[in-house]
């Protein structure tokens, strides 16, 4: 090995990665909110919809104070990976009725992927354990009907909205601990 030499700084550090993750999450939350509103306008929901394959909400307002960095990032990444797969599935399985929202769903998927990359980079830089990404709990088959895919879209966007909402709060809280 040669004599000690300094390395130039790379483009970001863990704290900058966390800032970036917060910005991406906020932006994704706004997109999801807007898309969910479009869905409600075009296809009014009759009550709440759910999908067994979606992850259960990880955090409540009451548990925010006890959050630990590894747990939050691991859970967030696993949950977002699940939503990413569900959006992918929705785009493939959607009937003609949902095709009008294809550009928005495509953009949502791309932004989700970007956030997942940023979270993974952050976990790598912090050397936090990276769990094996979960497959959806229930295999995603084609929706039973056009109405089935609309109900699925309501459930996916609603769940993603709630997940991103706690994610923003959780990540902002974690910023103070890094």
């Amino acid at each position: 090995p040669g004599p000690p030499a300094g390395s130039p700084r790379v483009s970001s550090d863990p704290r900058a990665d966390l800032d970036s993750a917060v910005l991406l999450t906020r932006s994704l939350l706004a997109d999801t909110r807007q898309l969910a509103a479009q869905m409600r306008d075009k296809f009014p929901a009759d009550g709440d919809h759910n999908l067994d394959s979606l992850p259960t909400l990880a955090m409540s307002a009451g548990t925010l104070g006890s959050l630990q960095l590894p747990g939050v990032l691991t859970r967030l990444r696993v949950d977002l990976m699940s939503y990413f797969r569900h959006v992918q599935w929705l785009r493939r399985a959607a009937g003609p009725s949902l095709k009008t929202l294809e550009p928005e769903l495509g953009a949502l998927q791309a932004r989700l992927e970007r956030l997942l990359r940023r979270l993974q980079l952050l976990m790598s830089r912090l050397a936090l354990p990276q769990a094996a990404p979960d497959q959806p709990a229930v295999p995603l088959g084609p929706p039973a009907s056009a109405w089935g895919s609309i109900r699925a879209a309501h459930a996916i966007l609603g769940g993603l909205h709630l997940t991103l909402d706690w994610a923003v709060r959780g990540l902002l809280l974690l910023k103070t601990r890094l």
């Epitope: 390395s7 790379v10 590894p70 993974q120 980079l121 936090l128």
Partner: antibody, heavy 114, light 111 residues
Framework: EVQLLESGGGLVQPGGSLRLSCAAS????????MHWVRQAPGKGLEWVAV????????YYADSVKGRFTISRDNSKNTLYLQMNSLRAEDTAVYYC???????WGQGTLVTVSS | QSVLTQPPSASGTPGQRVTISCSGS?????????VHWYQQLPGTAPKLLIY???ERPSGVPDRFSGSKSGTSASLAISGLRSEDEADYYC???????????FGGGTKLTVL
């Protein structure tokens, strides 16, 4: 400018012990996970151990598990590798690395030979 | 034997485009873990060249690019120069080993 400076390498007999240190500067050491990666003469890179930014998680390659211990002192910006029960196959340049790893030190040579 | 598989050698003439492959499995690259690439010039420490599959650290020329698909990744070097002669390593997290894994390295020769 980021600096990672390894020390503590040298010649040691099989079964012996050695403690490597890595002094970090030029970045927020306490915000980075840290690795030890080694390279045997003329061979490729082999990951040895990693410790999380706060020291709460430590993982080791199977080849060193139970013999090597990684630790860090964030107040001193220093990473350590305690190597016990050394074998001839542990002979390598040992690099300290930060993050992905994003940054690497220049390495310190450990030779295990009788 | 390395967990990630790379060709031991590659070569090209100045100005040419060269690609180096890196093949993994379902416990690393195939599990959607990011791939990073390192350049090791003779007698020096490795240097981060590409991170998160296709992102370049500041100071790395845009002649270097990365991509990933399924359980494989590749590094492309366009406009090959003599100073690119080095060993190139890919790396990714492996959840079964709970740590990063490296490829065996590819020695690039500029003819």
């Amino acid at each position: 400018e980021v600096q990672l400076l390894e020390s503590g390498g040298g010649l040691v007999q099989p079964g012996g012990s050695l403690r490597l240190s890595c002094a970090a500067s030029g970045f927020t050491f306490s915000s980075y996970g840290m690795h030890w990666v080694r390279q045997a003469p003329g061979k490729g890179l082999e990951w040895v151990a990693v410790i999380s930014y706060d020291g709460s998680y430590k993982y080791y390659a199977d080849s060193v598990k139970g013999r090597f211990t990684i630790s860090r002192d964030n107040s001193k910006n220093t990473l350590y590798l305690q190597m016990n029960s050394l074998r001839a196959e542990d002979t390598a340049v040992y690099y300290c690395a930060a993050g992905v790893p994003d940054y690497w030190g220049q390495g310190t040579l450990v030779t295990v030979s009788s | 034997q390395s967990v990630l598989t790379q060709p031991p050698s590659a070569s090209g003439t100045p100005g040419q485009r060269v690609t180096i492959s890196c093949s993994g499995s379902s416990s690393n690259i195939g599990s959607d873990y990011d791939v990073h690439w390192y350049q090791q010039l003779p007698g020096t420490a490795p240097k981060l060249l590409i991170y998160s599959n296709n992102e370049r650290p500041s100071g790395v020329p845009d002649r270097f690019s990365g991509s990933k698909s399924g359980t494989s990744a590749s590094l492309a070097i366009s406009g090959l120069r003599s100073e690119d002669e080095a060993d190139y390593y890919c790396a990714a997290w492996d959840f079964s080993l709970y740590g990063p894994v490296f490829g065996g390295g590819t020695k690039l020769t500029v003819l």
